[in-house]
C-alpha cells in the first residue's frame, strides 16, 4: 500500500529574466527512493538516480541546475516556461509518487499591472 | 476594458460532445492564463483545468482528465473548452475566469449546460 | 487535493452589521517563497463571480474598503465593516497555492 505524500513549493509566480526552485518532498513512507525525474508536459528536463546521479536533458542544459537536493533550479526564465511541472518519484517497494507545481512567469508588464504581489 | 464573452446556453443529448468558447478583449490574450470553473447546483465551484495561450501549456484538474479538453486560438483571442461523453452529471453552469498570480481577475458570464434525453 | 473548508455555511444578517468569514485550509496555503494564494470571491445570483481580495490581504481595483481580507498559513478571515444590500450573495474563498486549485464550499450571506 501507498502511504507516501508529497510536498512541493506550491505554484510559484515569477518575472521574466528572474530564477525559481522547484522542490518536492516525499514523507510518510519507508519506500526507498531510487530515482526522481522533472517533467514539463511531456518533456523530460532532469533525471536524478541514486546511483548514477544527475542527467540535464541537453535542451535544458543552459538554464537548469540539479538541486538543492532533489530539486530543480531555473534560471533565465522567459514566459515560456510558464507551465505545469512534475516530480516523479520512483520508489522501491511503495512505486511511483508525482507531485505538481505550476509555474507562472509574467513579462514585465504584466508583472508591474496592478501592483498585485511582490514576486520572489 | 478586460471582457470574457462566452456563448450561449446549450441543450444536449447524453453521450454526445459540444464545446463553449470564450472570447477575451480588452487585454493581452497570450499574457494570462485562461481557467475553466464549473458550478453544480447553483453552489459548489470546482477548477476544470487551465491553458496558457503563449504555448499551449495546460493544466487539468485529475476529475476532469478524459472528460475536459482545453484548446485556444491565439488569432481570435479565443478560449474553447470541449465536454466528451456528456452525462445528466455534467449538467451545470461554466465559467472561463483569466487568472493572474493564481487569483481569477475577470470572468465570463457563464454557459448553462443542460444534459437531457 | 487541499480541502478547503468554510465557516458558516449561511450567514444571516442585517444592513449595518460587521461579518467575519472564515476560511480553513487543510495545508499551508504559503508557497516556498513565502508567497500565499488565497483569494476570496462575491457570487451575486445571476452574475459571474467577482474578485474581492487577492493575496489574502489586498482588494482588487473598484472594491470598497468595507472588506478587508486577513490571515497565514491555514487560516483565513474575510471581513465586511458595514453591510450593504449590494453584498449579499454567495462569498467563496480560493486557494490558488497548490495544484489543483481548489474553492471553499461557499458562505450565504442573507438578510435575516
Known amino acids: 500500500m501507498m502511504t507516501g505524500t508529497i510536498e512541493t513549493t506550491g505554484n510559484i509566480s515569477a518575472e521574466k529574466g528572474g530564477s525559481i526552485i522547484l522542490q518536492c518532498h516525499l514523507s510518510s513512507t519507508t519506500a526507498q527512493v531510487t530515482q526522481v525525474n522533472w517533467e514539463q508536459q511531456d518533456q523530460l528536463l532532469a533525471i536524478c538516480n541514486a546511483d548514477l546521479g544527475w542527467h540535464i536533458s541537453p535542451s535544458f542544459k543552459d538554464r537548469v541546475a540539479p538541486g538543492p537536493g532533489l530539486g530543480l533550479t531555473l534560471q533565465s526564465l522567459t514566459v515560456n516556461d510558464t507551465g505545469e511541472y512534475f516530480c516523479i518519484y520512483h520508489t522501491y517497494p511503495d512505486g511511483t509518487y508525482t507531485g505538481r507545481i505550476f509555474l507562472e512567469v509574467l513579462e514585465s508588464s504584466v508583472a508591474e499591472h496592478g501592483a498585485r504581489f511582490q514576486i520572489p | 476594458e478586460v471582457q470574457l464573452q462566452q456563448s450561449g446556453p446549450e441543450l444536449v443529448k447524453p453521450g454526445a460532445s459540444m464545446k463553449i468558447s470564450c472570447k477575451a478583449s480588452?487585454?493581452?490574450?497570450?499574457?494570462?492564463?485562461m481557467n475553466w470553473v464549473k458550478q453544480s447546483h447553483g453552489k459548489n465551484l470546482e477548477w476544470i483545468g487551465l491553458?496558457?495561450?503563449?504555448?499551449?501549456?495546460?493544466s487539468y484538474n485529475q476529475k476532469f482528465k478524459g472528460k475536459a479538453t482545453l484548446t485556444v486560438d491565439k488569432s481570435s483571442s479565443t478560449a474553447y473548452m470541449e465536454l466528451l461523453s456528456l452525462t445528466s452529471e455534467d449538467s451545470a453552469v461554466y465559467y472561463c475566469?483569466?487568472?493572474?498570480?493564481?487569483?481569477?481577475?475577470?470572468w465570463g458570464q457563464g454557459t448553462t449546460l443542460t444534459v437531457s434525453s | 487535493d487541499v480541502v478547503v473548508t468554510q465557516t458558516p455555511l449561511s450567514l444571516p444578517v442585517s444592513f449595518g452589521d460587521q461579518v467575519s468569514i472564515s476560511c480553513r485550509s487543510s495545508?499551508?496555503?504559503?508557497?516556498?517563497?513565502?508567497?500565499?494564494?488565497l483569494s476570496w470571491y462575491l457570487h451575486k445570483p445571476g452574475q459571474s463571480p467577482q474578485l474581492l481580495i487577492y493575496g489574502i490581504s489586498n482588494r482588487f481595483s473598484g472594491v470598497p474598503d468595507r472588506f478587508s481580507g486577513s490571515g497565514s498559513g491555514t487560516d483565513f478571515t474575510l471581513k465586511i465593516s458595514t453591510i450593504k444590500p449590494e453584498d449579499l450573495g454567495m462569498y467563496y474563498c480560493l486557494q490558488g497555492t497548490h495544484q489543483p486549485p481548489t474553492f471553499g464550499g461557499g458562505t450565504k450571506l442573507e438578510i435575516k
Open positions: 495545508q499551508s496555503l504559503a508557497n516556498s517563497y513565502g508567497t500565499t494564494y
Open positions: 491553458i496558457f495561450p503563449y504555448n499551449g501549456g495546460t
Open positions: 480588452g487585454y493581452s490574450f497570450t499574457g494570462y492564463t
Open positions: 475566469a483569466r487568472s493572474l498570480r493564481f487569483s481569477f481577475d475577470y
